[in-house]
Interface confidence: low
């Protein structure tokens, strides 16, 4: 599992040559059933906010027990609270399900701060605001946990949407999405639109607010603007991608691109922040500080520990730079860039003492385990996890928070040579073992 500010809270203290076809979402691409168009029943099926995670309603067992489940592309277990816990309003009661099957096997998952453990079984699972199917899936029934469930988050379990290789206790435990695709006609892809609030929400507002959409089996054109650009999934474990260049307000950080992916870069909806390797974080903060030097902020702000507040409606967005990540494209020597605004990387938080102010935390932090493109990044974009074609697509989200001057962007192509050198390679000649 990933080190750092992950949800549930796992905090630690890490272009194409011209004339080539662009890998955009076009009508020329072969159709797959259910791949394109409108998925009305799935739009707005997520609730929550970046600080506490985005969850979808699911039902488990027979008769169905309804639970809210955190959507996590950074893990691969479907795990639900299955015993009373002070932070849970409800939990999965296996003894009440006639379709529950015990696998007679335990599972233990430690995080940086906390853990969960439980018992493995299978049961019938469906997603009310998802495809009209029921699947038998592996479920980890969480019987004991520490600092896993979040008070007031309103979710009771976690849906790990990554690949089997990182499933616990081992890769033989088939993840939910694999079971879904195997047992139904749902195409092997899903897409996420996470809609950050842009302003602090109190508890009642969170429960009533729209958090976004998880489109299972397809792409909904109403959820993005412009074109979708795709980056290859480097390896099917986490959703690993390769970053080839980083810019702050258009200024290249000028680092060896290997540093950006040390030792991996992943797209993870279960992490709050944009997390960067130590050297990259330090260079990025130095550059962001320089760009925003008209105001001085305490060191604790840049460490993500201290809030900074402005009088309601007066946040000086314009003094903060935009951040661009260049991702490897699908075509040789081609990359594209995704650009986020301070509206994404300054996370709104409620400060009870100054409720009339707008308060923010700096949501870029240091990592010892590579780059993690968490909710901070994802809230700017509609993100397509195209597992069938081993690629991840980015387009500007129709719900991203911006101002009158700047907007998040997905742009390309950019010629970028030697991109393969930006990733960390396994020191062996035959890399085919990676694909087993």
């Amino acid at each position: 599992t990933q080190h750092g500010i992950r949800l549930p809270l796992r905090s630690g203290l890490g272009g194409a040559p011209l004339g080539l076809r662009l890998p955009r979402e076009t009508d020329e691409e072969p159709e797959e059933p259910g791949r394109r168009g409108s998925f009305v029943e799935m739009v707005d099926n997520l609730r929550g906010k970046s600080g506490q995670g985005y969850y979808v309603e699911m039902t488990v067992g027979s008769p169905p027990q309804t639970l809210n489940i955190l959507v996590d592309t950074g893990s691969s277990n479907f795990a639900v609270g299955a015993a009373p816990h002070p932070f849970l309003h409800r939990y999965y009661q296996r003894q009440l399900s006639s379709t529950y099957r015990d696998l007679r096997k335990g599972v233990y998952v430690p995080y940086t701060q906390g853990k969960w453990e439980g018992e493995l079984g299978t049961d019938l699972v469906s997603i009310p605001h998802g495809p009209n199917v029921t699947v038998r899936a592996n479920i980890a029934a969480i019987t004991e946990s520490d600092k896993f469930f979040i008070n007031g988050s309103n979710w009771e379990g976690i849906l790990g949407l990554a690949y089997a290789e990182i499933a616990r206790p081992d890769d033989s435990l088939e993840p939910f999405f694999d079971s879904l695709v195997k047992q139904t006609h749902v195409p092997n892809l899903f897409s996420l639109q996470l809609c950050g609030a842009g302003f602090p929400l109190n508890q009642s507002e969170v429960l009533a607010s729209v958090g976004g959409s998880m489109i299972i089996g397809g792409i909904d054109h109403s959820l993005y603007t412009g074109s979708l650009w795709y980056t290859p999934i480097r390896r099917e474990w986490y959703y690993e991608v390769i970053i080839v260049r980083v810019e702050i307000n258009g200024q290249d950080l000028k680092m060896d691109c290997k540093e950006y992916n040390y030792d991996k870069s992943i797209v993870d909806s279960g992490t709050t922040n944009l997390r960067l390797p130590k050297k990259v974080f330090e260079a990025a903060v130095k550059s962001i500080k320089a760009a925003s030097s008209t105001e001085k902020f305490p060191d604790g702000f840049w460490l993500g520990e201290q809030l900074v507040c402005w009088q309601a409606g007066t946040t000086p967005w314009n003094i903060f730079p935009v951040i661009s990540l260049y991702l490897m494209g699908e075509v040789t020597n081609q990359s594209f860039r995704i650009t986020i605004l301070p509206q994404q990387y300054l996370r709104p938080v409620e400060d009870v003492a100054t409720s009339q102010d707008d308060c923010y935390k700096f949501a870029i932090s240091q990592s010892s385990t590579g780059t993690v493109m968490g909710a901070v990044i994802m809230e700017g974009f509609y993100v397509v996890f195209d597992r069938a074609r081993k690629r991840i697509g980015f387009a500007v989200s129709a719900c991203h928070v911006h101002d009158e001057f700047r907007t998040a962007a997905v742009e390309g192509p950019f010629v970028t040579l030697d991109m393969e050198d930006c990733g960390y390679n396994i020191p062996q000649t035959d890399e085919s073992t990676l694909m087993t």
Epitope: H3, G12, T112, E165
Partner: antibody, heavy 119, light 107 residues
Framework: EVQLVESGGGLVQPGGSLRLSCAAS????????IHWVRQAPGKGLEWVGW????????DYADSVKGRFTISADTSKNTAYLQMNSLRAEDTAVYYC????????????WGQGTLVTVSS | DIQMTQSPSSLSASVGDRVTITCRAS??????VAWYQQKPGKAPKLLIY???FLYSGVPSRFSGSGSGTDFTLTISSLQPEDFATYYC?????????FGQGTKVEIK
């Protein structure tokens, strides 16, 4: 059952080389960090370095940087510690250990293999 | 590098005693500290991670506490099999560093 088995230790002269192996079984090798930790006779534990078998990234203690190299072969579920330019102070029991990427701890250890550097 | 300093370096205790070992980091390491037990001729075993979380299968008489720079390992009621050397380790940053060890001997 998780198992880590080191091999390749022995007596070597100062300036010489040795390659230790760590054969792993009972878990998804590429899903964990593999660390090498050493313990000089009668002394405490000293971290030597680590590798991510999946990504290939490595890091080393300053005391061995430039002399030791860690590698891994995921097809064999084996990590290696190549030790060059050995010194008397490198004499120790060398352990390989598995750890999650977070937290940065070692939850399973091998039995260790003794490396003696002496003329 | 972050230095980890353990105290005492050794102690004598009897079965049933409450034993406390402390570890001080040379800088703030939040709660990123682990504790290990090592018996002669054997490999270390993980007891506690993230300062206070008991590793799977470790008896509940072991507990850990602390944050920032000061950390404690407590054995609430010492058992015969607990006589060993105990090491703390910071997992806050690379390189991970260990304390020099505390040997718990039979009185």
């Amino acid at each position: 059952e998780v198992q880590l088995v080191e091999s390749g230790g022995g007596l070597v002269q100062p300036g010489g080389s040795l390659r230790l192996s760590c054969a792993a079984s009972g878990f998804t090798f590429s899903g964990y960090a593999i660390h090498w930790v050493r313990q000089a006779p009668g002394k405490g534990l000293e971290w030597v370095g680590w590798i991510s078998p999946a990504g290939g990234s490595t890091d080393y203690a300053d005391s061995v940087k430039g002399r030791f190299t860690i590698s891994a072969d995921t097809s064999k579920n084996t990590a290696y510690l190549q030790m060059n330019s050995l010194r008397a102070e490198d004499t120790a029991v060398y352990y390989c250990a598995r750890g999650p990427f977070s937290p940065w701890v070692m939850d399973y250890w091998g039995q260790g293999t003794l490396v003696t550097v002496s003329s | 590098d972050i230095q980890m300093t353990q105290s005492p370096s050794s102690l004598s205790a009897s079965v049933g005693d409450r034993v406390t070992i402390t570890c001080r980091a040379s800088q703030d390491v939040s709660t990123a500290v682990a504790w290990y037990q090592q018996k002669p001729g054997k490999a270390p075993k993980l007891l506690i991670y993230s300062a206070s979380f008991l590793y799977s299968g470790v008896p509940s008489r072991f507990s850990g506490s602390g944050s920032g720079t000061d950390f404690t390992l407590t054995i609430s009621s010492l058992q015969p099999e607990d006589f060993a050397t105990y090491y703390c380790q910071q997992s806050y940053t690379t390189p991970p560093t260990f304390g020099q060890g505390t040997k718990v001997e039979i009185k």
